[in-house]
């Protein structure tokens, strides 16, 4: 056969579907690899061919489109399972070709089992809700194209294992689930089960997502530097180790590029000829506010180092702040035998 543009195994599309549910999988060629759509390809005389490699096998084989009740079918650029079976797991390839052109891509499909509480190895999308922000909604994802608009499915929402009904601040509204005022207690996995009829059969679509309640932009503030502060003086003798922590609180801000950094005499530590090390740690609150600590350390501080200006800086999408550490050289304690004795007139 003639050469084929092989896009390899597209691991971006690690498709996971539930066992015994319908699945519609679009050929990724038209979405991500080619600059034309299926209609254009079809009208240009190109044919879309599907085949697959079973899990733990090397042999490519054609997909059987003659199964009872058309369990697997193809419609335009979509491969349909009505429904899936566990042993449908494997790598699927769609190939677009005619006598002069050929292009193909493979993608992994995993058919996943779930338990009665919707627990499964499925990777769950995360939806962030702002805490105490007013009404916010989540929508049952990835159900478009499964049934025509004339069909009115029934939708049941669950939090974890429990059907959502008569919840205080969570209201099912068809494909949407409304949170009147999102609270930390609303964190968890939410499942919508969409039930619809087709050709005398009833199908179920199960979609689970994780809700994470995060800090609200209404409450977001510029970074707050807790340390260094005016109450702590770093008093050291030459030769001692100087350790100055910079601890900064950041409100949760979607996509904010948060940074903490030190300058010494207005320069990056790297631009100064002293042996400085900086270690960073990060912790998060339940609403994904962030606390970053950067500890500046000079192993053996000199009297010159103790005269320098050490400033901790922090920035987020809300603004920038800076705070200087109070560093001074420890005045040596008087030596009694010489200095105090002199005060008493000893010679």
């Amino acid at each position: 056969s003639e050469r084929c543009d092989d896009w390899g195994l597209d691991t971006m599309r690690q498709i996971q579907v539930f066992e015994d549910e319908p699945a519609r999988i679009k050929c990724p060629l038209f979405e991500h690899f080619l600059k034309f759509n299926y209609s254009t390809a079809h009208s240009a005389g190109l044919t879309l061919i599907w085949y697959w490699t079973r899990q733990d096998r090397d042999l490519e084989e054609p997909i059987n489109f003659r199964l009872p009740e058309n369990r697997i079918s193809k419609e335009k650029d979509v491969l349909w399972f009505r429904p899936t079976l566990l042993n449908d797991t494997g790598n699927y390839t769609c190939m677009l070709r005619n006598t002069t052109y050929c292009s193909k891509v493979a993608f992994p499909l995993e058919v996943v089992q779930k338990d009665s509480c919707f627990n499964s190895p499925m990777k769950l999308p995360v939806h962030k809700l702002y805490i105490e922000y007013g009404i916010q909604r989540i929508t049952c994802p990835n159900v478009d194209g499964y049934f025509p608009s004339s069909v009115k499915p029934t939708i049941t929402w669950y939090m974890g294992c429990y059907k959502i009904q008569n919840f205080n601040n969570v209201i099912p509204e068809g494909m949407n689930l409304s949170f009147l005022i999102a609270l930390i207690s609303n964190n968890g996995n939410y499942t919508c089960v969409v039930t619809y009829p087709e050709n005398g059969r009833t199908f179920h679509l199960t979609r689970t997502l994780t809700v994470k309640v995060v800090g609200s932009p209404k409450n977001a503030v510029p970074p707050v530097i807790h340390s260094p502060n005016d109450h702590v003086v770093y008093e050291k003798e030459p030769g001692e180790e100087l350790l100055i922590p910079c601890t900064v609180y950041f409100s949760f801000l979607m996509d904010s590029r948060n940074e903490v950094w030190w300058t010494i005499d207005g320069k990056k530590p790297d631009d100064i000829t002293i042996d400085v090390t900086i270690n960073e740690s990060i912790s998060h609150s339940r609403t994904e506010d962030e606390t970053r600590t950067q500890i500046l350390s000079i192993k053996k501080v000199t009297s010159e180092d103790l005269k320098r200006s050490y400033v901790c800086h922090a920035r987020s999408a809300k603004g920038e702040v800076a705070k200087a550490a109070k560093v001074k050289q420890k005045v040596p304690a008087p030596r009694y035998t010489v200095e105090l004795a002199c005060g008493f007139g000893a010679t």
């Epitope: 996509d255 904010s256 940074e259 903490v260 530590p269 790297d270 960073e280 920035r315």
Partner: antibody
Framework: EVQLVESGGGLVQPGGSLRLSCAAS????????MSWVRQAPGKGLVWVAE????????YYPDTVTGRFTISRDNAKNTLYLQMNSLRAEDTAVYYC???????????WGQGTTVTVSS | EIVLTQSPGTLSLSPGERATLSCRAS???????LAWYQQKPGQAPRLLIY???KLASGIPDRFSGSGSGTDFTLTISRLEPEDFAVYYC?????????FGQGTKVEIK
């Protein structure tokens, strides 16, 4: 003298993989966040990935999320970019660059060319 | 995503003239987080201005930056022959970090 030297570019088929490296010298590598920025032929600059000083935090634009992985080895003063499921539109010169706090990309490498073509 | 739009696309000027390049953001950028770069053919970009108005190390003072919020400007007071190049603005207030599409300053 600060130096960033990229390597690992080349010709790869669509769907293939490539690993770029960036060797850093002349500065305290572990003090800087590091990024990869690419430039397609005749086009502008596009940020591709960033990694925090310690390597625990990574950031990507949607166009490469799931396909590209940035990593670093502070002991070897080296930055990496693992690129999988490569596409024709990933063809570009790839630069590594360093940043510190409010100082953006103050030093760049000379770039390494990645060509994705069958 | 913060989109940065540079204008004009091309600026045709003579050496000695003043160049004014604009960068407009689709949403507010904290001034400290806007930078300007110069790029010549076959070379890596070079940092000119950071924090909207601070001159990077080793950059001549004929380059200056100004602006805040959504509107930023790079000014070259008197163009030297070596200044003819492409200039990019860049923001890092929010991820993804984004660049403008570039302004080419060419010899008239």
């Amino acid at each position: 003298e600060v130096q960033l030297v990229e390597s690992g570019g080349g010709l790869v088929q669509p769907g293939g993989s490539l690993r770029l490296s960036c060797a850093a010298s002349g500065f305290t590598f572990s003090s800087y966040a590091m990024s990869w920025v690419r430039q397609a032929p005749g086009k502008g600059l596009v940020w591709v990935a960033e990694i925090s000083r310690g390597g625990s935090h990574t950031y990507y634009p949607d166009t490469v999320t799931g396909r590209f992985t940035i990593s670093r080895d502070n002991a070897k003063n080296t930055l990496y970019l693992q690129m999988n499921s490569l596409r024709a539109e990933d063809t570009a010169v790839y630069y590594c660059a360093r940043s510190y706090g409010n100082y953006p990309f103050d030093y760049w490498g000379q770039g390494t060319t990645v060509t994705v073509s069958s | 995503e913060i989109v940065l739009t540079q204008s004009p696309g091309t600026l045709s000027l003579s050496p000695g003239e003043r160049a004014t390049l604009s960068c407009r953001a689709s949403q507010s950028v904290i001034g400290s987080y806007l930078a300007w770069y110069q790029q010549k053919p076959g070379q890596a970009p070079r940092l000119l201005i950071y924090s909207a108005s601070k001159l990077a190390s080793g950059i001549p003072d004929r380059f200056s930056g100004s602006g805040s919020g959504t509107d930023f400007t790079l000014t070259i007071s008197r163009l030297e022959p070596e200044d003819f190049a492409v200039y990019y603005c860049q923001q890092d207030t929010r991820y993804p970090i984004t660049f403008g599409q570039g302004t080419k300053v060419e010899i008239k």
